[in-house]
Interface confidence: low
């Protein structure tokens, strides 16, 4: 699998992974003890033709253009977890691996 990586200075208009640091404290999510912030990343950009399309099905559906189908969207195609220390609803401190918190790769789907 292949995915583009960009930054805020990039002129790339196609689907790309951009850096984004999520600050839990800024959100008021104080029930998260650690990490207070982490690199989450995000996907943005255009999905034209077969560029970065994860599945052949995406291209075929777009070509067939059935009623109600939208074009492919730039979306995470690979994600990874992070380890977090947090309070649950019962005030207990939990340490756990939270899935799909980091975007590793973006594609058109």
């Amino acid at each position: 699998d292949f995915g583009l990586d960009c930054d805020e200075h990039s002129t790339e208009s196609r689907c790309c992974r951009y850096p984004l640091t999520v600050d839990f404290e800024a959100f008021g999510w104080d029930w998260i003890i650690a990490p207070k912030r982490y690199k989450a990343n995000y996907c943005s950009g255009e999905c034209e033709f077969v560029f970065l399309q994860k599945y052949p099905h995406t291209h075929l559906v777009h070509q067939a253009n059935p009623r109600g189908s939208a074009g492919p969207c730039c979306t995470p195609t690979k994600m990874s977890p992070i380890n977090m220390l947090y309070f649950n609803g019962k005030e207990q401190i939990i340490y756990g691996k939270i899935p799909a918190m980091v975007v590793d790769r973006c594609g058109c789907s």
């Epitope: 404290e25 800024a26 959100f27 104080d30 029930w31």
Partner: antibody, heavy 119, light 107 residues
Framework: QVQLVQSGGGLVKPGGSLRLSCAAS????????MNWVRQAPGKGLEWVSS????????FYSDSLKGRFTISRDNANNSLFLQMNSLRVEDTAVYYC????????????WGQGTLVTVSS | DIQMTQSPSSLSASVGDRVTITCRAS??????LGWYQQKPGKAPKGLIY???SLQSGVPSRFSGSGSGTEFTLTISSLQPEDFATYHC?????????FGQGTKVEIK
């Protein structure tokens, strides 16, 4: 158990200043947003200010901005509200509250302290 | 700023009655709403968070529902200790705002 003990209220003349304190115990203070809320005599509750766990982000009610300053001392588990240029309409019971962020909101409250602004 | 409109402002009810209090937000606040009980001369006490979750130690006769702009606090069978004022609060973002309060009195 969670405790929030307030102090610092009293009678003050218009234009005067007062500093309210809220001493926290029974929980990990430096992982919680803290708030001040007030209640004028016979009126409803009014949110005053919030400060996030490490003091990075501070929020005030638009009507109070510039006169009131919220702060915290995580080393001593304390929350403060410095009130300057006090007006008669600031007369109220002031409550501190512990806040569990945008997911849970305030849960525990201090006992309240009365601030009377009068000449 | 978001306005929270709470109704009724007061109501009279008897022990055992089912009581419903409503809070309406002027815009979508998802489920970021809490309900608080306050007795005269006392601090507010948390009842409900996230619109429908019961704070620990709160009796199950209290329940909350709703999301978006319409929220309800229900007391399924009013007890003598439930006569108090109830406040809703939106905490979706700042500035936060309370409803005007609902005083529940003995009929």
């Amino acid at each position: 158990q969670v405790q929030l003990v307030q102090s610092g209220g009293g009678l003050v003349k218009p234009g005067g200043s007062l500093r309210l304190s809220c001493a926290a115990s029974g929980f990990i203070f430096n992982t919680y947003t803290m708030n001040w809320v007030r209640q004028a005599p016979g009126k409803g509750l009014e949110w005053v200010s919030s400060i996030t766990s490490r003091g990075t982000y501070i929020f005030y009610s638009d009507s109070l901005k510039g006169r009131f300053t919220i702060s915290r001392d995580n080393a001593n588990n304390s929350l403060f509200l410095q009130m300057n240029s006090l007006r008669v309409e600031d007369t109220a019971v002031y409550y501190c509250s512990r806040d569990r962020g945008y997911t849970f909101g305030p849960d525990y409250w201090g006992q309240g302290t009365l601030v009377t602004v009068s000449s | 700023d978001i306005q929270m409109t709470q109704s009724p402002s007061s109501l009279s009810a008897s022990v055992g009655d089912r009581v419903t209090i409503t809070c309406r937000a002027s815009q979508d606040i998802r489920n970021d709403l809490g309900w608080y009980q306050q007795k005269p001369g006392k601090a507010p006490k948390g009842l409900i968070y996230a619109a429908s979750s019961l704070q620990s130690g709160v009796p199950s006769r209290f329940s909350g529902s709703g999301s978006g702009t319409e929220f309800t606090l229900t007391i399924s069978s009013l007890q003598p200790e439930d006569f108090a004022t109830y406040h809703c609060l939106h905490y979706d973002f700042h500035p936060r705002t309370f409803g005007q309060g609902t005083k529940v009195e003995i009929k």
